[in-house]
């Protein structure tokens, strides 16, 4: 239904708190360098304007689109060109081109310092003084670093943050209460960010059809008792919600997500028996809970997939009649039978099935041709299963840090031209898959591992797009999203790479490393490891282990020494010499 004033409609639907939070996120994701105070001022102006429109929908400018209203606000910021360069050119365009232009200027890797958490006492003081401003800062800092973060989910994480602070700031030992809880929220939020970025990439590069296929597979796994029409409706709605969020239409996105949650809770009987606990929660928690609800129990009497998709005489006729519907039905039927497969794998199987029908239905005797299609799925299924087994075995043997190092070596050999910080970030993230997935029950490992790796590799591709340096990476990133992970896995040592010359300063360390937090120490060591591989791409695992053990021993010794500086300056050069010899 059309509303006279879009902004009044969204303000009424969302309520002031969520409205303000979403507008702040939107501005922070578009203009990532502006301070919190600059954005907070704009948010207040937009909110005051929205209230005038609620009071009188016919008031001046209330009939303007949200893009026009928000774009005009952003373009009125002083010194836009000085701070944002060519992004200011967007302001010369009309809607919808202006918004598209803003979207294209979103930076996935903004040059902002890491978000440092203040110490507990200071955090609690500022939280108690002004909880609204405190949470505003949180939304601003996360949104500007993650310009595609799923906005309604970010409101959920802010709510979690709020609850943790409310609880822990009342404790005597605030630090030990806050740290593990906030670390947990941070880890979940970072995973949420890369997953959502993958969805937006899917939408941007391959369109709504690709995203909808992803949604059909995912929803069919989760709700195997829902019929195809129900799954299609949910997938269509979910696609709309994600399209809006990826497109910067955050108010519409949050509003439609709330509607979808409401619909699911009102139609539990035809969707799933597992929704009630989620549906009892307040809005943000409800929508979050629904997004990760456990799989419903699979119907016991499902016929073999072959009946309708291989043995049925009408396969090619059904395919001819309505390709997308027939392939969608195949994806639905296959996915609801396989909660143990990754969505990426299910989409690869659907793609293989489609290619088989395209080829076979054109032949003189199609059934003889497509009769073996299910058998041809076997290698596609075995490949990720082997990946999971091999990597989880390695993780169990080495632990998270050792596993990250193994991945770092592997990926540096595959793409040595990629910058060391990007390789280290990617390897650390890819290595977390062990902790995240390898501890799960057998039937949950594959979906967890492959879909998480796909999301991390999507970030690698986005960063590489900005400065393409490796043909290997370009090749894997150019194909379809579901083929990326197998493509990266299949890469071997890049034979075209000319090894980096050995620079002693790259491996020279100072006593300040001793006081770094453990995570930062690990990053320093991993940076050195990547540089070693770039120097000797064909070094054996044994050679690299020798060097890294020596390095760890050196750090341990010097950091325990009475005169750390002297130890580093005398033992450092000896370490460098031993490294060169070990790799010779």
């Amino acid at each position: 239904e059309a509303h006279k004033s879009e902004i009044a409609h969204r303000y009424n639907d969302l309520g002031e708190q969520h409205f303000k939070g979403l507008v702040l996120i939107a501005f922070s994701q578009y203009l990532q360098k502006c301070s919190y105070d600059e954005h907070a001022k704009l948010v207040q102006e937009v909110t005051d304007f929205a209230k005038t429109c609620v009071a009188d929908e016919s008031a001046a400018n209330c009939d303007k689109s949200l893009h026009t209203l928000f774009g005009d606000k952003l373009c009125a910021i002083p010194n836009l060109r000085e701070n944002y360069g060519e992004l200011a050119d967007c302001c010369t365009k009309q809607e919808p081109e202006r918004n598209e232009c803003f979207l294209q200027h979103k930076d996935d890797n903004p040059s902002l310092p890491p978000f440092e958490r203040p110490e507990a006492e200071a955090m609690c003081t500022s939280f108690k003084e002004n909880p609204t401003t405190f949470m505003g800062h949180y939304l601003h800092e996360v949104a500007r670093r993650h310009p595609y973060f799923y906005a309604p989910e970010l409101l959920y994480y802010a709510e979690q943050y709020n609850e943790i602070l409310t609880q822990c700031c009342a404790e005597a030992d605030k630090e030990s209460c806050l740290t593990p809880k906030l670390d947990g929220v941070k880890e979940k939020a970072l995973v949420s960010s890369v997953r959502q970025r993958m969805k937006c990439s899917s939408m941007q590069k391959f369109g709504e059809r690709a995203f909808k296929a992803w949604a059909v597979a995912r929803l069919s796994q989760t709700f195997p008792n829902a019929d195809f029409a129900e799954i299609t409706k949910l997938a269509t709605d979910l696609t709309k919600v994600n399209k809006e969020c990826c497109h910067g239409d955050l108010l519409e996105c949050a509003d439609d997500r709330a509607e979808l949650a409401k619909y699911m809770c009102e139609n539990q009987a035809t969707i799933s028996s597992k929704l009630q606990t989620c549906c009892d929660k307040p809005l943000l928690k409800k929508a979050h809970c629904l997004s990760e609800v456990e799989h419903d129990t699979m119907p016991a009497d499902l016929p073999a997939i072959a009946a309708d998709f291989v043995e049925d005489q009408e396969v090619c006729k059904n395919y001819a009649e309505a390709k997308d519907v027939f392939l969608g039905t195949f994806l639905y039927e296959y996915s609801r039978r396989h909660p143990d497969y990754s969505v990426s794998l299910l989409l690869r199987l659907a793609k293989k099935y489609e290619a088989t029908l395209e080829k076979c239905c054109a032949e003189a005797n199609p059934p003889a041709c497509y009769g073996t299609v299910l058998a041809e799925f076997q290698p596609l299924v075995e490949e990720p299963k082997n990946l999971v087994k091999t990597n989880c075995d390695l993780y169990e043997k080495l632990g998270e840090y050792g596993f990250q190092n193994a991945i770092l070596v592997r990926y540096t050999q595959k793409a040595p031209q990629v910058s060391t910080p990007t390789l280290v970030e990617a390897a650390r993230n890819l290595g977390r898959v062990g902790t995240k997935c390898c501890t799960l029950p057998e039937d949950q490992r594959l979906p967890c591992v492959e879909d998480y790796l796909s999301a991390i590799l999507n970030r690698v591709c986005l960063l590489h797009e900005k400065t393409p340096v490796s043909e290997h990476v370009t090749k894997c990133c150019s194909g379809s999203l579901v083929e990326r992970r197998p493509c990266f896995s299949a890469l071997t040592v890049d034979e075209t790479y000319v090894p980096k010359e050995f620079k002693a300063e790259t491996f020279t360390f100072h006593s300040d490393i001793c006081t770094l937090p453990e995570k930062e120490k690990q990053i320093k060591k991993q940076t050195a490891l990547a540089e070693l591989v770039k120097h000797k791409p064909k070094a054996t695992a044994e050679q690299l282990k020798t060097v890294m053990d020596d390095f760890a021993q050196f750090l341990d010794t010097c950091c325990k020494a009475a005169d750390k500086d002297t130890c580093f300056s005398t033992e450092g050069p000896n370490l460098v010499t031993r490294c060169k010899d070990a790799l010779a």
Partner: nanobody, 115 residues
Framework: QVQLQESGGGLVQPGGSLRLSCEAS????????MTWVRQAPGKGVEWVSG????????LYADSVKGRFTISRDNAKNTLYLQMNSLKPEDTAVYYC????????GGQGTQVTVSS
């Protein structure tokens, strides 16, 4: 909606000829292999002949090999079956189907071979 309309049947003496046509609509005809099947009174459906989407590959049941010729005109969305040297045992309702299906979709066209 997929539609297949067969025509060209009739009564013919043994040794005579007929040319059946099948007009297709509702799908991309040029991308699908097509088939002729037949059903004699009181019998099951029998596969007669198949042709690939481009018309570059054809197959025939042993019982009609050398007598029947399947062809297609993708520009006209039409499938043909040229039947020569007809025999009484060729008497049946003939149907065209998509992609090797043995499930008759259209009305079919009656072919009767009798002296």
């Amino acid at each position: 909606q997929v539609q297949l309309q067969e025509s060209g049947g009739g009564l013919v003496q043994p040794g005579g000829s007929l040319r059946l046509s099948c007009e297709a609509s509702g799908f991309t005809f040029s991308r699908f292999g097509m088939t002729w099947v037949r059903q004699a009174p009181g019998k099951g459906v029998e596969w007669v002949s198949g042709i690939s989407s481009l018309g570059d590959s054809t197959l025939y049941a042993d019982s009609v090999k050398g007598r029947f010729t399947i062809s297609r005109d993708n520009a006209k969305n039409t499938l043909y079956l040229q039947m020569n040297s007809l025999k009484p045992e060729d008497t049946a309702v003939y149907y065209c189907t998509i992609g090797g299906s043995l499930n008759p979709g259209g009305q079919g066209t009656q072919v009767t071979v009798s002296s």
